[in-house]
């Protein structure tokens, strides 16, 4: 004969444990039903009656099968630098994540405790490492032959336009100005997708005859160091 299915509450066999979604009540010394997510134990079980569950109140939740006497309070409303990516329901806590342009400077178990604005790279510097949900932008000086004239948390150093005749040489924060109506080539192919700028900015304002006519090939490399260069944009 097959073993009979026990209905809660029931006394477990010595040495055995309660089944899935059941818990052992120390007082009643019985296996009793857990409450489903979104509910809590309103009345604990006895030897003769099973757990009585009730729905969580507004702004409270339980995420797991449980026998807690009260539901957990949802976290406070998301701050102005955050967006609510998961609403507070009876079955889940509110989750706040940083809004676009911000990153999580201090995380918690789920979501973010403290958001901070992503660093913006000033002119002469480009984004070398983009910001993520949990890390800030890293800025690096633009390499020779490249520039950035923006203050931005996304802009990388871009190649100077290549001129037939240079009117004003480019530097780290300014594109080259050509005398002819149009440059021979507006940028080196593929260079815009550089994951991080090579960071020497030396020689950008050196009074050389045509510094932009033969661009450095160093910024065409996918990444990595260029040799230290002697030069100056200094005073």
């Amino acid at each position: 004969l097959p073993a009979q299915v026990a209905f809660t509450p029931y006394a477990p066999e010595p040495g055995s444990t309660c089944r899935l979604r059941e818990y052992y009540d120390q007082t009643a010394q019985m296996c009793c039903s857990k409450c489903s997510p979104g509910q809590h134990a309103k009345v604990f079980c006895t030897k003769t009656s099973d757990t009585v569950c009730d729905s969580c109140e507004d702004s409270t939740y339980t995420q797991l099968w449980n026998w807690v006497p009260e539901c957990l309070s949802c976290g406070s409303r998301c701050s102005s630098d955050q967006v609510e990516t998961q609403a507070c329901t009876r079955e889940q806590n509110r989750i706040c994540t940083c809004r676009p342009g911000w990153y999580c400077a201090l995380s918690k178990q789920e979501g973010c405790r403290l958001c901070a604005p992503l660093r913006k790279c000033r002119p002469g510097f480009g984004v070398a490492r983009p910001g993520t949900e949990t890390s800030d932008v890293v800025c690096k000086p633009c390499a020779p032959g490249t520039f950035s004239n923006t203050t931005s948390s996304t802009d990388i150093c871009r190649p100077h336009q290549i001129c037939n005749v240079v009117a004003i040489p480019g530097n780290a924060s300014m594109d080259a100005v050509c005398t002819s109506t149009s440059p021979t080539r507006s940028m080196a192919p593929g260079a815009v997708h550089l994951p991080q700028p090579v960071s020497t900015r030396s020689q950008h304002t050196q009074p050389t005859p045509e510094p932009s006519t033969a661009p450095s090939t160093s910024f065409l490399l996918p990444m990595g160091p260029s040799p230290p260069a002697e030069g100056s944009t200094g005073d």
Partner: antibody
Amino acid sequence: QVQLVQSGAEVKKPGASVKVSCKASGYTFTDYIIHWVRQAPGQGLEWMGWIDPDYGNTDYADKFKKRVTMTADTSISTAFMELSRLRSDDTAVYYCARDDGSPLVMDAWGQGTLVTVSS
Amino acid sequence: DIQMTQSPSSLSASVGDRVTITCQGSQNIDNYLAWFQQKPGKAPKLLIYSTYSLQTGVPSRFSGSRSGTDFTLTISSLQPEDFATYFCFQYNQGYMFGGGTKLELK
């Protein structure tokens, strides 16, 4: 907390070289460039140049480019500034300062290193 | 190279006074101007960056403003700890400090 700790005072003869160190702590050393600034006794601040510790790339002020060498050792989070062919007018306090390339410039400084050039 | 002309070079004032220090750029530097405070024997301390932005922890009596290529540092009500030397610093094209303003007790 962020700290830049510089090496101690130096006395040098004219024509000699001096190497000043700047040890960084409390932040990711390679995420910031290090500037060097000097100040002669009773005078103003003078920008000398910067180094990007990530690659060792540099940018020097015209005035110093023939005599200064800036280096960095990322394994010990330390930047170095070496000034050669010292003259008496190089007597100054030399400072390092960090810069993350954002508008927030030079937000942390070393305590300064006095270099005295005297025969 | 961009030159920064700072004035006055020295200034006497009393506690509670409103003080202004100006810096003029030889050409446009956008808003890339910072102000530093330096006390004797100490390293400079960043007060204001990007012309207007107050560095964390700096009292709100310090403020920065701009009119064209003229930049101003204002201390609304001088406190005893404010007597020091102040430097402007442009970081738009290269890097250049102003000559400094020594603020002394009258």
